[in-house]
């Protein structure tokens, strides 16, 4: 049974005579008259088992003491620490010449843990041990201070175990403590890689290369390696591991980010506080969830604050110029916390009678500089229809607008384009033809471009070729032209007029009056 004694973490004790309870029971040769196991009291009045010999009277002493078998435990080099007291030969009058002040240390490798006898020729000498300090007498109080400590190492070892032996050649000596240990580089964590307990190499200059394994919740950046030096110290760390996303290094471990913190990538960074307008409710967050009403764009880094769509643009002003409209506005009061704001223009053409019945303006309308993705706060819209109700919506958008269904980011204005000269009348018809008259009817222009104030009918005899013509004006979309000559070809043109002026004449309608007093109904442009 051994008691616990504290030694450096890089030393593994194979034998400690001070920790043995009861007798050590090592083998002495000769059995009597040489080394003797003696219990002495330490400074705390605790018994210590020592081996003593003080055969200083006779020459040619050869007293051997052998330990029990010591397992090697895979070590290739072991260290022997001997604490001993050696009496100065000068304190023993009359023994000069026979008294010595050294002893010899030996070892013998063996797979047999039950060897009963000491065979001196099997043992290999490690060293002759001399005292740094020897003294005449030692009292119990001083003894601990005056102990000599010598450490020797031996290797490479290859068998399962070994025996140590101490040869006395005539000294007055007490072995107070014998400790045998090997050195290891103790389990350690460096750069987030764990390196296992590693026994040092066979010789005092060897380095053992050891590959580390990443600690929990981490991954290799570069292959982690270290070298275990002969003194049990780790040397030259190479490579490292990085804490996984959602984890940070704390006390050599990768620990989950605390609530309210996150880490997006495997880096050596620490967890960061959730950006503004976001939160995490679990430990180990790799990103933070946006607050209600806040969003993160696809290409936003996890470190960016959550943002929201902008509010509506402000101060929308319209300027109508005939069939063009210039719109200007101010930036929204709230940009949602983003810089990537832009504007989209929506054009709707609405009926005069029922403004709710609007439909898209279509592709005929043109926008300068563009309809969507405007970076400026103005746009010019052209190729509108004259005298038409339009509603223009200016939408403020940013990188997260698409996530928000609420249409509160637009401002709208309804305008009516100015009146313009109407377009030409597409179809003029002769409804009745007599000897002296022609009844005409026509459709409203495709684009009245305002309120049609009147229609103007220009006609002339074909032979005159417009050198002499007459004008008839009417507010209606039909008229009777009277006082014509029978059996004569006439050409008719119709145009409409708004407050903005006349439109173009229609294509000519050629009609020939009858010779008989009967009525001829015509529907073509060239009734005869």
């Amino acid at each position: 049974v051994t008691g616990s004694r504290v030694y450096p973490a890089n030393e593994v004790t194979l034998l400690d005579s001070r920790s043995v309870q009861g007798e050590l029971g090592w083998i002495a040769s000769p059995l009597e008259g040489g080394w003797e196991e003696v219990s002495i009291m330490d400074e705390k009045n605790t018994p210590i088992r020592t081996y003593q010999v003080c055969n200083v009277m006779e020459p040619s002493q050869n007293n051997w003491l052998r330990t029990d078998w010591i397992t090697r435990e895979g070590a290739q080099r072991v260290y022997i620490e001997i604490k001993f007291t050696l009496r100065d030969c000068n304190s023993l009058p009359g023994v000069m010449g026979t008294c010595k002040e050294t002893f010899n240390l030996y070892y013998y490798e063996s797979d047999n843990d039950k060897e009963r006898f000491i065979r001196e020729n099997q043992f290999v000498k490690i060293d002759t041990i001399a005292a740094d300090e020897s003294f005449t007498q030692v009292d119990i109080g001083d003894r601990i201070m005056k102990l000599n400590t010598e450490i020797r190492d031996v290797g490479p070892l290859s068998k399962k175990g070994f025996y140590l032996a101490f040869q006395d050649v005539g000294a007055c000596i007490a072995l107070v403590s014998v400790r045998v240990f090997y050195k290891k580089c103790p389990l350690t964590v460096r750069n987030l890689a764990q390196f296992p307990d590693t026994i040092t190499g066979a010789d005092t200059s060897s380095l053992v290369e050891v590959r580390g394994s990443c600690v929990n919740n981490s991954e290799e950046k570069d292959v982690p390696k270290m070298y275990c030096g002969a003194d049990g110290e780790w040397l030259v760390p190479i490579g490292n591991c990085l804490c996984n996303a959602g984890h940070e290094e704390r006390s050599g471990e990768c620990q989950a980010c605390k609530i309210g913190y996150y880490k997006a990538l495997s880096t050596d960074a620490t967890c960061a506080k959730c950006p503004p307008h976001s939160y995490s409710v679990w430990e180990g967050a790799t990103s933070c969830t946006c607050d209600r009403g806040f969003f993160r764009a696809d290409n936003d880094a996890a470190s960016m604050p959550c943002t929201r769509p902008p509010s509506a643009p402000l101060n929308l002003i319209s300027n109508v110029n005939e069939t063009s409209v210039n719109l200007e506005w101010s930036s929204p009061q709230n940009t949602g916390g983003r810089q990537d704001i832009s504007y989209n223009v929506v054009c709707k053409k609405c009926g005069a009678g029922d403004p709710s019945k609007c439909r898209p303006c279509g592709s005929g309308v043109h926008y300068t500089p563009q309809q969507n993705g405007l970076k400026t706060t103005k746009v010019s819209i052209t190729d509108l229809l004259a005298h038409t109700n339009y509603t223009f919506e200016i939408w403020a958008v940013n990188g997260v607008s698409k996530y928000n269904p609420n249409p509160d980011q637009s401002v709208s204005v309804t305008v009516t384009t100015n009146q313009a000269a109407p377009s030409s009348i597409a179809l003029v018809q002769a409804k009745e033809v007599t000897r002296y008259s022609v009844a005409l009817a026509w459709l409203e222009p495709d684009r009245p471009n305002g309120v049609i104030l009147e229609y103007e009918v220009k006609y002339y005899e074909k032979d005159q070729n417009e050198r002499s013509y007459r004008i008839v004006r009417t507010a209606a979309r039909n008229t009777d032209i009277k006082g014509l000559n029978p059996l004569t070809s006439y050409v008719f043109h119709v145009r409409a007029r708004t407050a903005a002026g006349y439109g173009d004449f229609s294509e000519p309608l050629e009609v020939t009056t009858n010779t008989v007093p009967s009525r001829i109904i015509g529907d073509g442009a060239n009734s005869t």
């Epitope: 009277m57 006779e58 007291t85 009359g94 010449g97 030692v138």
Partner: antibody, heavy 121, light 106 residues
Framework: QVQLLQSGAEVKKPGASVKVPCKAS????????MSWVRQAPGQGLEWMGW????????TYAQGSTGRFVFSLDTSVSTAYLQISSLKAEDTAVYYC??????????????WGQGTLVTVSS | EIVLTQSPATLSVSPGERATLSCRAS??????PAWYQQKPGQAPRLLIY???TRATGIPDRFSASGSGTDFTLTISRVEPEDFAVYYC????????FGQGTKVEIK
């Protein structure tokens, strides 16, 4: 068994000499020093000195006169104490005792039974 | 030379009691003394020597302690066979004994 055997009592006249033998057995005689101690009647112990049984080199107590001589005959494992010019105050039991040297201090671990020397006219 | 003074000269104890014997040196010594027991008509017997080590066959009720100039022999529970005279002995270039303490039955 280790033992030291001393001779029987001696009665001597003042001025005479006496040689007290101490025969050792049960161990290697030359491996341990031999000490001599005397005890006057009703008194305490007085150390007289010791002899290196290997070399024959003696060590005498401080203040010891030249009347005390330690000697050996290793062939018969015997140590001797010779006292010359005996005085009445030399009357005592004389003990031989084997010396035990240790690194932490010395003691006399085996004692003879003692030889009473009486000096009387 | 160093003089050892033992006290008390006589110590009266009952069997089973603890006995404490003192040995004082005239000057500081660097070693604990040896202790001997002597019964009437017998040679002394070594009890304790260097570093408070009990000699062969000495029961563990005997123990020694102290340093410098003051030393103590303790008999933890006195047995009938322990009634005797006890001597301390200092070793060095010249060995000296104390004058002895007699332990008697109370």
């Amino acid at each position: 068994q280790v033992q030291l055997l001393q001779s029987g009592a001696e009665v001597k006249k003042p001025g005479a000499s006496v040689k007290v033998p101490c025969k050792a057995s049960g161990y290697t005689f030359t491996s341990r020093a031999m000490s001599w101690v005397r005890q006057a009647p009703g008194q305490g112990l007085e150390w007289m000195g010791w002899i290196n049984t290997n070399t024959g080199n003696p060590t005498y107590a401080q203040g010891s006169t030249g009347r005390f001589v330690f000697s050996l005959d290793t062939s018969v494992s015997t140590a001797y104490l010779q006292i010359s010019s005996l005085k009445a105050e030399d009357t005592a039991v004389y003990y031989c005792a084997r010396v035990r040297f240790t690194v932490y201090g010395d003691g006399m671990d085996v004692w003879g039974q003692g030889t009473l020397v009486t000096v009387s006219s | 030379e160093i003089v050892l003074t033992q006290s008390p000269a006589t110590l009266s104890v009952s069997p089973g009691e603890r006995a404490t014997l003192s040995c004082r040196a005239s000057q500081s010594v660097s070693s604990n003394p040896a202790w001997y027991q002597q019964k009437p008509g017998q040679a002394p017997r070594l009890l304790i020597y260097g570093a408070s080590t009990r000699a062969t066959g000495i029961p563990d009720r005997f123990s020694a302690s102290g340093s410098g100039t003051d030393f103590t022999l303790t008999i933890s529970r006195v047995e009938p066979e322990d009634f005797a005279v006890y001597y301390c002995q200092q070793y060095g270039p010249s060995w000296t004994f104390g004058q002895g303490t007699k332990v008697e039955i109370k």
